[in-house]
Every structure is written in C-alpha cells, then in structure tokens.
C-alpha cells in the first residue's frame, strides 16, 4: 500500500519561515501534488501549491517556493510575515494523486521541538 | 475543441473477439490520462480499463481481467481495447473518456460511445 | 472497492423546483467526487468535479457540496433541459466508482 510522508520544519534563520517536504511511497505515476495547511484539502483546508509534472507550479501566498526535488517528493517554502503566516501548531497536509492507484494524503505540524518532524 | 470518437463496436458471438477504437483531437492526447468505460443496456456506468498517460500503468476490474488489453498510440493520437473470450454480459455502450488531473481524475470529455453487443 | 450509494434512484419534480441528490460513499473519498449528467442515447457529461466545482458552460444552477463520505448535487431551479440521469463518481482510490444513478422525470 503506498504511503505519504511530511516533514515539517522551522528555519533557523527566519523563525517564522516553514519548510514543508512530502514524498510518496510507492509505484505509479504521480499526477498531481496538492499542499495545504489547516487540515486535508477536502475537509477544510487551504490549498498553498499544486505541482504537475509536466504542467508546472501553481502557488498561493504565503507560499513562496514549491518545488520536485525527486519524482516522488516536493518541498515547500512559506513566508514568514503577514497576517496569513503560519504558527508553529498549523497542520500541513500533501495529497499525492498517482494514476490509475488514487490519492493518498498524509499530514504534519511542527514537532514539539525545534528539531526537524516526519509525519506519515 | 477537445473530440473522442469511437468506432469498431459491432454484434459478435460469445467467445468472440473485438478490438475498439478511440480517435482523439483537440489536445495533447499524449498528456493525458485515459479509459474505457461501458454502459450495459438500461443499467450503471463501469470503468473496464484504464492507461496512464505514458502508458506504463493499466487497470482493469476482475470482471474483465485477462480478457481486455487496453493500449494506446501516441503517434495516432489513439486509444484501443483489445476484447477476447467476449461473454453475453460484456454487452454494453462502450465509451473512451480523458481524465483531468486537475480535476481530481474526473473524466472530463468523453466519447459518443460504441455498442457491443454478444450474442450466439 | 469504494461502494457509491445514490438516492433517490428516480426523482419527479416540476420546471422551477429545487432538487438534491446524494451519493454516500462506503469510506471517505476526500474531495475526489464528480458529478455527470446523461440523457438518453447520449455520452455523460461532467458537471461538477472536487465536490464543488462547476465545470466549464455548467449553468450556476448546478451546485455540489459535501465532504469525506455524504456528498450532494443541487439543482436550484429545474429548466426543461435539466431531466435526465445524474451519476456521482468517486475518483479517489481505483476503481473509480459511480453511483448507479438517479433519473430525474418531469412530474
């Protein structure tokens, strides 16, 4: 059965800037990735990025860089100033569809310490 | 304008063999997620195949497994179904559908549909 | 496989009335509900995808709604052209699944 993973983690150098990696466990093509934070994009919450692997990037503030870093995992990093700043108890969640297998979705929030969180 | 035009449907005793076509235009066809989907007389839709865009992931349903080969040209902008060893309760409309990733893998455009029936 | 539980099977309703259909899902499905609209004799057409989300040329009458596994489709003022057959489908996990359907008559 495949499986998403989430990391989240707090930038040392700007307190208030996010770094979101998910990656998929498993075969299939991945289709489509879509990040969203304050709970699963279909109960509630927002979507940040969606990334296609052929047709590209697509982005919402306070996002500020979505990227592949392998065919089966992104990273995400989000702004850290504004009023629509994450803190540190916000939840993350990435979706990963794969075809013809369906979606899987994982979520993850800032472990209580400072070190870096895997979530799956 | 996004167009799927199926032929090769036809009357074909059990046990029997037909090979369905799909012609599609309008698009990229070869960015595209693709599926066969029937509709047996008065009765529900069924997915009876699927092929990821770069052909190397299929699905079929037990009911067809073994039975239907799906296959794609992205040369000829085609898709097809290979149907052996036809029994009287593959009798259906057959459809080819593309499926938007964007949309969560809703089919988004789909043929006019090709009758097969079986029958001795 | 998903199960996909439409209801009501056949509805008959009158030009101008409000209409729900729903489609209940044997486990969550997330967001991944569309929604299909079939006359007789003819392809199905999408109308809406992600629970909620109008497909393109979809009339404003038509609104989806739901979340995890009860999901609905609202017609809120029927036009003679809105009867027909209406399909939900789950395209979360394979197979994709459908609903087997609710023909909508004029009463």
């Known amino acids: 059965t495949p499986e998403v993973w989430v990391q989240v983690r707090m930038e040392a150098t700007e307190l208030s800037s996010f770094t979101i990696r998910c990656g998929f466990l498993g075969s299939g093509s991945i289709s489509l990735v879509t990040v969203s934070w304050g709970g699963p994009n279909g109960a509630g919450g927002t979507t940040l990025a969606v990334l296609h692997p052929e047709r590209g990037i697509r982005q919402w503030a306070p996002a500020r860089q979505a990227r592949w870093e392998t065919q089966s995992s992104i990273s995400l990093i989000l702004e850290g100033s504004g009023a629509s700043s994450p803190c540190a108890n916000t939840t993350f969640c990435c979706k990963f569809a794969s075809f013809p297998e369906g979606s899987w979705e994982a979520c993850g929030s800032l472990p209580p310490s400072s070190d870096p969180g895997l979530s799956a | 304008e996004v167009q799927l035009v199926e032929s090769g449907g036809g009357l074909v005793k059990p046990g029997g063999s037909l090979r369905l076509s799909c012609a599609a235009s309008?698009?990229?066809?070869?960015?595209?997620?693709m599926s066969w989907v029937r509709q047996a007389p008065g009765k529900g839709l069924e997915l009876v195949s699927a092929?990821?865009?770069?052909?190397?992931?299929?699905y079929y349903p037990d009911t067809v497994k073994g039975r239907f080969t799906i296959s794609r040209d992205d040369a000829e902008n085609s898709l097809y179904l290979q149907m052996n060893s036809l029994r009287a309760e593959d009798t259906a409309v057959y459809y080819c559908s593309r499926h938007e990733d964007y949309f969560g893998f809703a089919m988004d455009s789909w043929g006019q549909g090709t009758l097969v029936t079986v029958s001795s | 496989d998903i199960q996909m539980t439409q209801s009501p099977s056949s509805l008959s309703a009158s030009v101008g009335d409000r209409v729900t259909i729903t489609c209940k899902a044997s486990q969550s499905v997330s967001n991944d509900v569309a929604w299909y609209q079939q006359k007789p004799g003819k392809a199905p057409k999408l109308l809406i995808y992600y629970v909620s989300n109008r497909f393109t040329g979809v009339p404003s009458r038509f609104s989806g709604s739901g979340s995890g596994t009860d999901f609905t489709l609202t017609i809120s003022s029927l036009q003679p052209e809105d009867f027909a057959t209406y399909f939900c489908q789950q395209a979360y996990r394979s197979p994709w699944t459908f609903g087997q359907g609710t023909k909508l008559e004029i009463k």
């Open positions: 309008g698009f990229t066809f070869s960015s595209y997620h």
């Open positions: 092929i990821s865009r770069d052909g190397d992931s299929t």
